[in-house]
């Protein structure tokens, strides 16, 4: 009986199991019982990343500089080009088809994780004892100044947006 299923890296055609083309190659002609599957390498700007029976290779992704994209890893016959974003920008999706500027953390928030080419800035609220008075994509929450270590006293309490204000100790109290 002719086969109804084939082994791994084979495909069924005309009641016959043919070898799939290896990654980096496309199908030119199916096998016969006299000759093997005919495959051809993908051209320089193309790829196929799986064992396949595709008659056309896929075009490498274009990293469009007008969209803020740049090449992170050049494609091969077996892999697609990987794009990333220029400095100060990050991808809008996992496939990285366009870029947007990194978010800045507003006053009262600090940077928990600096943005990369593929992920946005992660901000966190400044906890008690810390503040941020700037809008920044890099600055973490800073600790309030310790007046005591400077032999000063707190004249104005700090908030999540402002540092404490230190002043001289009241000598009359001493």
């Amino acid at each position: 009986e002719p086969p109804t299923a084939c082994r791994e890296k084979q495909y069924l055609i005309n009641s016959q199991c043919c070898s799939l083309c290896q990654p980096g190659q496309k199908l030119v002609s199916d096998c016969t019982e006299f000759t093997e599957t005919e495959c051809l390498p993908c051209s320089e700007s193309e790829f196929l990343d799986t064992w396949n029976r595709e008659t056309r290779c896929h075009q490498h992704k274009y990293c469009d500089p007008n969209l803020g994209l740049q090449v992170q890893q050049k494609g091969t016959s077996e892999t697609d080009t990987i794009c990333t974003c220029e400095e100060g920008l990050h991808c809008t999706s996992e496939s990285c088809e366009s870029c947007v500027p990194h978010r800045s953390c507003l006053p009262g928030f600090g940077v928990k994780q600096i943005a990369t080419g593929v992920s946005d800035t992660i901000c966190e609220p400044c906890p008690v004892g810390f503040f941020s008075n700037v809008s920044s994509a890099f600055e973490k929450c800073r600790p309030w100044t310790s007046c005591e270590t400077k032999d000063l006293v707190v004249q104005q309490a700090g908030t999540n947006k402002t540092d404490v204000v230190c002043g001289p100790q009241d000598r009359q109290r001493a």
Epitope: P2, N14, S15, Q16, S29, T32, E33, F34, T35, E36, E38
Partner: antibody, heavy 117, light 107 residues
Framework: EVQLLESGGGLVQPGGSLRLSCAAS????????MSWVRQAPGKGLEWVSG????????YYADSVKGRFTISRDNSKNTLYLQMNSLRAEDTAVYYC??????????WGQGTLVTVSS | DIQMTQSPSSLSASVGDRVTITCRAS??????LNWYQQKPGKAPKLLIY???SLQSGVPSRFSGSGSGTDFTLTISSLQPEDFATYYC?????????FGQGTKLEIK
């Protein structure tokens, strides 16, 4: 025991026709691809034609395409090669062979075809 | 069609010698190559399939290697019955094609 026995060869004039037969025994004929290979006197081997198992496709060398026809009768365990418009350069010993995994593992003893006026 | 070129065309050797026959394809055929032995007045016999696999019943002194365009048939220690003509045959592209043969003669 696998056996392949060719017949039908002989002397024929240029432009004439001949039908070769290959009687198979000792294996399930219908399950195997079969082919014809020829060898001109004192020369090398030339693959002429092949036919797939289970009534599969037919394939020909460019040198015989349009002139030769390969066929099989699974009920008679027989392979055929119909040769028309024969030329002097078709003179050769014609072998039938069984195919397995892209190789010819059993061959007949051959039948001589001579095309001459 | 793919051209198969064997070298040498003929070769003289003695019993016990190690002999190497090469076969070159005009384009890459991966490992899709067979080797056959033919003695005068007889049908060819399959020795090696898929470039390096020994056909059942063939002595282990025969071995094959190579891939892409360059292939080799090696007989490690020639026996009297090995004097014959050897053919390579590709099955990477339609139609299958043979090399012109290498005649192995007694020195």
């Amino acid at each position: 025991e696998v056996q392949l026995l060719e017949s039908g060869g002989g002397l024929v004039q240029p432009g004439g026709s001949l039908r070769l037969s290959c009687a198979a025994s000792g294996f399930t004929f219908s399950s195997y691809a079969m082919s014809w290979v020829r060898q001109a006197p004192g020369k090398g081997l030339e693959w002429v034609s092949g036919i797939g198992s289970y009534g599969g496709g037919t394939y020909y060398a460019d040198s015989v395409k349009g002139r030769f026809t390969i066929s099989r009768d699974n009920s008679k365990n027989t392979l055929y090669l119909q040769m028309n418009s024969l030329r002097a350069e078709d003179t050769a010993v014609y072998y039938c062979a069984r195919y397995v995994n892209f190789g010819m593992d059993y061959w007949g003893q051959g039948t001589l075809v001579t095309v001459s006026s | 069609d793919i051209q198969m070129t064997q070298s040498p065309s003929s070769l003289s050797a003695s019993v016990g010698d190690r002999v190497t026959i090469t076969c070159r394809a005009s384009q890459s055929i991966s490992s899709y190559l067979n080797w056959y032995q033919q003695k005068p007045g007889k049908a060819p016999k399959l020795l090696i399939y898929a470039a390096s696999s020994l056909q059942s019943g063939v002595p282990s002194r025969f071995s094959g290697s190579g891939s892409g365009t360059d292939f080799t048939l090696t007989i490690s220690s020639l026996q009297p019955e090995d004097f014959a003509t050897y053919y390579c045959q590709q099955y990477g592209r339609n139609p299958p094609t043979f090399g012109q043969g290498t005649k192995l003669e007694i020195k």
